[in-house]
């Protein structure tokens, strides 16, 4: 038995922040599990963790230096990545376990959403215009 | 056949470390269907779960030792480790490694443990 | 955390005599009809055996004599009729949710 993940295809960071929504086909309440966020086609990058127990807050960190927290709903854990930079433009890959109670439960793969970075586009600002050509 | 064989116990300063191993043979710790944990018994005393890692690499450990312990594993090598910081007298046990499958989380395999004494 | 507490903690036993051990958690450990909640002997200087999985299972191998039964928050293992490789310790272990615990054991002594 395996937990569908469903993801948006594509988001675009403005602001260089995003948030990516994964709704599962599994209620997540009074359940304990670990929710996580993957970057690359080969998932190779744990961007952010979301651990989630049924008499704790959630716990959110990244060990990979992504500025992340995470939001639980019943059926979906939603994490909000700032700071990324242009060079993130990537694929990102939802990942859930059910730990607790038993049966142990992971996802089938989902598609991914790629998630497009724009950089900010700095403009000169009338009251420092910069230095004059002679 | 399924077994497990820990190794690495003996004698350890207080404030030291530990890391212990917990070779496993007849199943694969990354496949699917099965886990391991670590479990510890002081000498005359009951029977205490110390963590367990998942065929996915995902760890959970016990609160009272979480800030003290970690679980990893070498895939190559089919082996499970345990490392324990800053040791104190109580953490003098046995220590266990056991597999559980992901129906009911029962532990159904259990290595012959290892003992770990804490002393000065 | 939940808490089990088995009684009694040592009882003493003839051989051919029926043995029951019961376990008492501290909330239900039951999920979906399944109780998480399984059966260990364990002999001096020996790692735990596994004699029953989800309350009542008998695990592959342990001989017919031991059972077990309850739901909820009350469970109990007996030993229909007691062999001498029966005298152990016996420990309940609840796999519903973390922290996993045991039970403090009861010892099952010769009489």
């Known amino acids: 038995n395996k937990i569908l993940v469903k993801q948006s295809p594509m988001l675009v960071a403005y602001d260089n922040a995003v948030n990516l929504s994964c709704k599962y086909s599994y209620n997540l309440f009074s359940r304990e599990f670990r929710a996580s966020l993957h970057k690359g086609l080969d998932s190779a990058v744990e961007v952010c963790v979301v651990y989630g127990n049924y008499s704790q807050q959630l716990q959110v960190y990244s060990k990979t230096g992504f500025n992340c927290d995470g939001k639980l709903g019943n059926e979906s854990v939603t994490f909000y990545l700032q700071n990324l930079y242009v060079n993130q433009t990537d694929i990102y890959f939802c990942k859930i376990e059910v730990m607790y109670p038993p049966p142990y439960l992971d996802n089938e793969k989902s598609n991914g959403t790629i998630i497009h970075v724009k950089g900010k586009h700095l403009c000169p600002s009338p009251l420092f215009p910069g230095p004059s050509k002679p | 056949e399924v077994q497990l064989v820990e190794s690495g116990g003996g004698l350890v300063q207080p404030g030291g470390s530990l890391r212990l191993s917990c070779a496993a043979s007849?199943?694969?710790?990354?496949?699917?269907?099965?886990?391991v944990s670590w479990i510890r018994q002081a000498p005359g005393k009951g029977l205490e779960w110390i963590g367990s890692?998942?065929?996915?690499?995902?760890?959970y450990y016990s609160p009272s030792l979480k800030s003290r312990v970690t679980i990893s594993r070498d895939n190559s090598k089919n082996t499970l480790y345990l490392q324990l910081n800053s040791l104190r007298a109580e953490d003098t046990a046995v220590y266990y490694c056991a597999r559980y499958e992901y129906d009911y989380y029962a532990f159904d395999y259990w290595g012959q443990g290892t003992l770990v004494t804490v002393s000065s | 955390d939940i808490q089990l507490t088995q009684s009694p903690s040592s009882l003493s036993a003839s051989v051919g005599d029926r043995v029951t051990i019961t376990c008492r958690a501290s909330q239900s450990v039951d999920f979906y009809g399944i109780s998480f909640l399984h059966w260990y002997q364990q002999k001096p200087g020996k790692a735990p055996k596994l004699l029953i999985y989800?309350?009542?299972s008998l695990e592959s191998g342990v001989p017919s004599r031991f059972s077990g039964s309850g739901s909820g928050t009350d469970f109990t293992l007996t030993i229909s009729s007691l062999q001498p490789e029966d005298f152990a310790t016996y420990y309940c272990?609840?796999?519903?949710?973390?922290?996993?615990?045991f039970g403090q054991g009861t010892k099952v002594e010769i009489k």
């Open positions: 007849g199943f694969s710790l990354s496949t699917g269907g099965v886990g």
């Open positions: 989800a309350a009542s």
């Open positions: 272990q609840q796999s519903y949710r973390t922290p996993l615990t």
């Open positions: 890692i998942y065929h996915s690499g995902s760890t």
